[in-house]
């Protein structure tokens, strides 16, 4: 039975040209995290594998930095980066947990972080 929950940074906004940390946290389970995939729709951004470390997609290799932790730092933001991001936790023995973050990249200097929220 899957008992865990994913906590994410929720809806967030950031300035064009700036950077943002995409962060998820898996709680309420003793399952072992074997891999975390970061995706935008069906496109891979990066993978953090427990044994092999980080792999950054070619499309993002020049502006994605691994971490902090299992999170991802997205740099040199453009308005095209606006959209949904998913953290996909591969765990044993539970299976897969998915968290969602919505990022809005703003032209102006007004960019506020949304509240944290949980996805069961």
């Amino acid at each position: 039975m899957m008992t865990g929950t994913i906590e994410t940074t929720g809806n967030i906004s950031a300035e064009k040209g700036g950077s943002i940390i995409l962060q998820c946290h898996l709680s309420s389970t003793t399952a072992q995290v074997t891999q975390v995939n970061w995706e935008q729709q069906d496109q891979l951004l990066a993978i953090c594998n427990a044994d092999l470390g980080w792999h950054i997609s070619p499309s993002f290799k020049d502006r994605v930095a691994p971490g902090p932790g299992l999170g991802l730092t997205l740099q040199s933001l453009t308005v095209n980066d606006t959209g949904e991001y998913f953290c996909i936790y591969h765990t044993y023995p539970d299976g897969t947990y998915t968290g969602r973050i919505f990022l809005e990249v703003l032209e102006s200097s007004v960019a506020e972080h949304g509240a944290r929220f949980q996805i069961p």
Partner: antibody
């Protein structure tokens, strides 16, 4: 030594499905992506997509989404590509290749190729 | 998608010649370019990665260079076993794309 041994050529009817295999030997299967590449006669290769065998994470060239499906069997160190709803456009040589996990963006060993002929 | 163009589809040269094969990208690819050799029997081998890094086991007569959108593969002293088709491939972003190939023949 590193080897990627592909299944033999296939002759299939339009509308059918085919599954091509790629058996890896001489290295740690889970430490490398398996890449799939299509080559029609007289044309340059086309990248279909990739699978990370350890987790089964698969990513596709948008052009081949819905056409190709990747799987991998860690116990036999074998990757598979299924092609569905075959048409004459799918007649080609299909290659598997490996790409090291991490920030290594080249295909350093290739299979010998599998020739697929789709004909009524 | 980024288009890779190899304008010379076939090339004839003599043994011992210095041969240069060119490849251009539809936009800048920041040296994110690989070269592969495909023998007449279909066997594919990686020659060069990241524009100019020689893959292990590849003879030193092969070299690569370029920047921006224009790249080249040079064979300094053509040998009989170099008869093959050569493909460039970028990895600036997904999807990876390949050039149409340059077939090298002996005069």
């Amino acid at each position: 030594q590193v080897q990627l041994e592909q299944s033999g050529g296939e002759v299939m009817k339009p509308g059918a499905s085919v599954k091509i295999s790629c058996k890896a030997t001489g290295y740690t299967f889970s430490n490398y992506w398996i890449e799939w590449v299509k080559q029609r006669p007289g044309h340059g290769p086309e990248w279909i997509g990739e699978i990370l065998p350890g987790s089964g994470s698969a990513y596709y060239n948008e052009k081949f989404r819905g056409k190709a499906t990747f799987t991998a069997d860690k116990s036999s160190n074998t990757a598979y590509m299924q092609l569905s709803s075959l048409t004459s456009e799918d007649s080609a040589v299909y290659y598997c290749a490996r790409q090291k996990y991490g920030n290594y963006y080249y295909f350093d060993y290739w299979g010998q190729g599998t020739t697929l002929t789709v004909s009524s | 998608d980024i288009q890779m163009t190899q304008t010379t589809s076939s090339l004839s040269a003599s043994l011992g010649d210095r041969v240069t094969i060119s490849c251009s990208a539809s936009q800048g690819i920041s040296n994110y370019l690989n070269w592969y050799q495909q023998k007449p029997d279909g066997t594919v081998t990686l020659l060069i990665y990241y524009t100019s890094s020689l893959h292990s086991g590849v003879p030193s007569r092969f070299s690569g260079s370029g920047s921006g959108t224009d790249y080249s593969l040079t064979i300094s002293n053509l040998e009989p076993e170099d008869i093959a088709t050569y493909y460039c491939q970028h990895y600036s972003k997904l999807p990876y794309t390949f050039g149409g190939g340059t077939k090298l023949e002996i005069k």
